[in-house]
Amino acid sequence: MATQADLMELDMAMEPDRKAAVSHWQQQSYLDSGIHSGATTTAPSLSGKGNPEEEDVDTSQVLYEWEQGFSQSFTQEQVADIDGQYAMTRAQRVRAAMFPETLDEGMQIPSTQFDAAHPTNVQRLAEPSQMLKHAVVNLINYQDDAELATRAIPELTKLLNDEDQVVVNKAAVMVHQLSKKEASRHAIMRSPQMVSAIVRTMQNTNDVETARCTAGTLHNLSHHREGLLAIFKSGGIPALVKMLGSPVDSVLFYAITTLHNLLLHQEGAKMAVRLAGGLQKMVALLNKTNVKFLAITTDCLQILAYGNQESKLIILASGGPQALVNIMRTYTYEKLLWTTSRVLKVLSVCSSNKPAIVEAGGMQALGLHLTDPSQRLVQNCLWTLRNLSDAATKQEGMEGLLGTLVQLLGSDDINVVTCAAGILSNLTCNNYKNKMMVCQVGGIEALVRTVLRAGDREDITEPAICALRHLTSRHQEAEMAQNAVRLHYGLPVVVKLLHPPSHWPLIKATVGLIRNLALCPANHAPLREQGAIPRLVQLLVRAHQDTQRRTSMGGTQQQFVEGVRMEEIVEGCTGALHILARDVHNRIVIRGLNTIPLFVQLLYSPIENIQRVAAGVLCELAQDKEAAEAIEAEGATAPLTELLHSRNEGVATYAAAVLFRMSEDKPQDYKKRLSVELTSSLFRTEPMAWNETADLGLDIGAQGEPLGYRQDDPSYRSFHSGGYGQDALGMDPMMEHEMGGHHPGADYPVDGLPDLGHAQDLMDGLPPGDSNQLAWFDTDL
């Protein structure tokens, strides 16, 4: 039967006290397959004395010994007598120190030490020879073990295949004992028949002890490459997966750690585990409560799911997301939280798992650990949150997470800031509750400071600017946010981001933010003073030329430059100028940049949104008599009249307003004809007097742009669809948000702002129109 030591080895399975169970598993009777061992090791002591930190000399003890040792006084004769005894027994003392086994039993040798706890000088000098002797003895024992095992293995193999289960059980215990010694362990793993017999026995037995011993044997073998290969070749993986269904905890623990070792180090193991149904079994085990067991199980899941879509879907179908989120909510053991966050990170790039994790409360659960002292845990949680964040815009109960994310913007870790900004950007998109929450916890100030600190690191500035863009429109605190950007000295840096070396995704986001900031009249003058208007016009001209060039070349397809359509830049810049043009001084600057011909040309755009913003800016400019005349002189009447019949209400309304303003100085009969025309086209369903709606166009857009302008355009960008976030390489999955990395090798020097008449000069100081860089794909929510 099994020895006491055997039974002790995994009795943690039966322990009611979970802490005791955990501490037991830490001992080497449970080899931890590498996941836990790092924390508890100390470097071996060269003196063989163990951990030097535990060897501090207790001075009080030393003093006590001195007092004790010399409190009695000796006579001269006594001293001479003792000296004589020492001289006579010197040879024995040396022999006793170096070869204690040669002494006669019961022979007394006087020690030169008063305290038996302290070794004598001779004993200390003998230590190396004792170590050598032990090494020789160990070598002999190793050879003996190897010989013994070599002779025993063929017979034990037969017994494992015996018909008599009693014999099989005893043989299993014996094999397990052999597997604990290194020499005999190697002998076992070199016998394919033996390993096959162990696997077969483990799979077929109904006896708990046999299952425990065979699983334990395979576990012991799994710490050697040769053993892993032997297990793999003997069909051990399906057998071990079967053992994951064992009701006996010790068997379960042996099986999972052995599988973990196989998954880590044995080629072909992953596929074999998947084929054997290991994923389903492992997910089912996530309701266990032993934290170390869960840590290894989740690590197995991570290894299996990483880079394998089918595995991710199996985990989903088995209820994995909910179980993993529960772990993140329930436990505090760092290694378990870390391994679980790694699985969630891998699953978070799967479009099917993503909503399931979010629905299970994954955002909130991951948010709980963002202030953990473990940096690796925090980073994994952030990466996962960033991947999930575009699917979580409808989630409730995000207050805590949002508050923590705003705090993390102040971190000194660039990765933490990048992720926090990306998550905030996505979570504030089209969610007015989240927008208000972020504003209330000082999000605007934190984001502005983040942009200021980030310099030209676009992986930070772009999501931060997007978040600011979202926060400055369509919620109750939007006006406060628009003011706050200015009050926290954000306008200069925002305008600066319109210039090189900014890339198109960042420029697009910045243009959108400026448009929202312009909704606040107090920002009109500062934006003008920072030179926002000429730069917006410059960008508009450049983008428009790009679209025209493509059209003239017969291209009907909208082309992406760094993931941004130039039509979006045209629309964004015109929209921003439209709002800025509410200010009389801004109108003068806009008109002075010779923009009216371009705005009129934009009325012919096939894109409704561009027609709308072009008509909108003309509508604002037409308030001034000279501008109205200039608009008419550019031949705007024809396209504007055409646009009166647009199906887009905003387009038609703005067109009407421009025509109306252009008619201010016209004769009465012209005004009358225009009024009839406007009434018939604008109020097809509900006729009313035109003069009652004279201001109709002026506030369109001010109330949160119901007309199709996407201030909250999330422009999500998924890196991972291309298999980007490769964990092992340290290239982690990016967020689902347009985060343009800085593209090296592209420097855009800027000279003074050229006269807009010299179109070619506009090309300088702008991102390249053509880019073979990685394309970013925008998708609206």
């Epitope: 013994l148 025993a152 017994l159 009693v166």
Partner: nanobody, 118 residues
Framework: QVQLVQSGGGLVQPGGSLRLSCAAS????????MGWYRQGPGKQREFVAS???????NYAASVKGRFTISRDNAKNTVNLQMNSLRPEDTDVYYC????????????WGQGTQVTVSS
């Protein structure tokens, strides 16, 4: 060297009983299993029953409830009490001693004929 000497066996009518005994001599390790196997002409040797040094018994499904195995550790003997015998129990019965040493040692008795016939 271990020797196993079997006794008992013979001819018996269906439904009858027989007792087989086996005595082991020589250097016997304490960790062992003593058991009975049977083999008919041209057939595979088949497990019947066994008992460990700690009196844990194990039976083949075909004999469970009819046969009883017992042992005397002091005398190193094992007995097989066979009741409700059937014609299909007819075979040569072998005693086996398995000593769980490194390496394990298996010793066999000389065999005893049991015939169940009317």
């Amino acid at each position: 060297q271990v020797q196993l000497v079997q006794s008992g066996g013979g001819l018996v009518q269906p439904g009858g009983s027989l007792r087989l005994s086996c005595a082991a001599s020589g250097s016997i390790s304490s960790n062992n299993v003593m058991g009975w196997y049977r083999q008919g002409p041209g057939k595979q040797r088949e497990f019947v029953a066994s008992i460990t040094d700690s009196d844990l018994a194990n039976y083949a499904a075909s004999v469970k409830g009819r046969f009883t195995i017992s042992r005397d550790n002091a005398k190193n003997t094992v007995n097989l009490q066979m009741n409700s015998l059937r014609p299909e129990d007819t075979d040569v019965y072998y005693c086996r001693l398995t000593m769980m040493t490194y390496p394990p040692i298996i010793s066999w008795g000389q065999g005893t004929q049991v015939t169940v016939s009317s």
